[in-house]
Amino acid sequence: KESCDVQLYIKRQSYHSIFAGDPFKLECPVKYCAHRPQVTWCKLNGTTCVKLEGRHTSWKQEKNLSFFILHFEPVLPSDNGSYRCSANFLSAIIESHSTTLYVTDVKSASERPSKDEMASRPWLLYS
């Protein structure tokens, strides 16, 4: 019998390489059974995750999964950092793993850093 717990399928230790000025959609894959939970995004500040208020979010439905999307319109250099989604389910809070956005400021970047180079910036790795 499949579990009817809410699950948030952000990959552990995942990363995204994006450019300032571009639009970007950060997806939180959500598995639930009957009632779609309330989901929120937060941004990590040290060990505290600060809830993102007043941001453009939306839902996308696919076959076996829903996606709670945080829209960046456009991406700003200050969007650099780690994000987590959380779901309210039966009075419990389920937290996803964090995912890190590496934002390249096109004004200061002569060439795009390699994805591995960016992933090895230790000051950005919260998890």
């Epitope: 995204h16 060990t47 994805k115």
Partner: antibody, heavy 120, light 112 residues
Framework: QVQLQESGPGLVKPSGTLSLTCADS????????IHWVRQPPGKGLEWIGR????????RYNPSLKSRVTISSDKSKNQASLKLSSVTAADTAVYYC?????????????WGQGTTVTVSS | DIVMTQSPDSLALSLGERATINCKSS???????????LNWFQQKPGQPPKRLIY???KLDSGVPDRFSGSGSGTDFTLTISSVQAEDVAVYYC?????????FGQGTKLEIK
């Protein structure tokens, strides 16, 4: 059932480039991470690196980073390993392995491995 | 890099004896999510490694319950309560918390 299969030349010349492919016939690779691990004859296991096929992000073992490239092709459900400037010390069995997802995140499925000999 | 040190390097036991393999990491393997990504693998000659235990103590499906894992932080143990002939293999610990991922050097289990 997840089935991983490594393939590539079994013999590579010194200073050449080792190229291997990992085909995943039992899982959509974009939903997971694919790792490469090697094992020299009679020795232990060494982690080479991993790729997130969803976005191409790689993490490499610093001891090999200057010579290694891991890539993926979502349309073919494949990951690839390239190791340049090889020497006899790179002779090993090379494995690809799948990292299972939520909530365990460990290497749960392995290919059978392919033996690569570096020799002229 | 996190160094994973296993002890002993090898052990020879009689059938039915208890096997204890230790694994010590150079840093804590407790991740920010509160989980400890320490795994044990078994490798028999000519075969790929097979996962036995994940998250320190969770037994993989199909693994006999004579195998168990314990520990926390930097010190971990794999125990085989009653060694059987089919347990002859090399056992590796592996940490999935930090980059680069690292294995222990392996412990060879033989039957006396």
């Amino acid at each position: 059932q997840v089935q991983l299969q490594e393939s590539g030349p079994g013999l590579v010349k010194p200073s050449g480039t080792l190229s291997l492919t990992c085909a995943d016939s039992g899982f959509n690779i974009k939903d997971t991470y694919i790792h490469w691990v090697r094992q020299p004859p009679g020795k232990g296991l060494e982690w080479i690196g991993r790729i997130d096929p969803a976005n191409g992000f790689t993490r490499y073992n610093p001891s090999l980073k200057s010579r290694v490239t891991i890539s993926s092709d979502k349309s073919k459900n494949q990951a690839s390993l390239k190791l340049s400037s090889v020497t006899a010390a790179d002779t090993a069995v090379y494995y690809c392995a799948r990292e299972d997802g939520y909530p365990y995140y460990t290497l749960d499925s392995w290919g059978q491995g392919t033996t690569v000999t570096v020799s002229s | 890099d996190i160094v994973m040190t296993q002890s002993p390097d090898s052990l020879a036991l009689s059938l039915g004896e208890r096997a204890t393999i230790n694994c010590k990491s150079s840093q804590s393997l407790l991740d920010v999510d509160g989980k400890t990504y320490l795994n044990w693998f078994q490798q028999k000659p000519g075969q790929p490694p097979k996962r036995l235990i994940y998250l320190v103590s969770k037994l993989d499906s199909g693994v006999p319950d004579r195998f168990s894992g314990s520990g926390s932080g930097t010190d971990f143990t794999l125990t085989i309560s009653s060694v059987q002939a089919e347990d002859v293999a090399v056992y590796y610990c592996w940490q999935g918390t930090h980059f680069p991922r690292t294995f222990g050097q392996g412990t060879k289990l033989e039957i006396k």
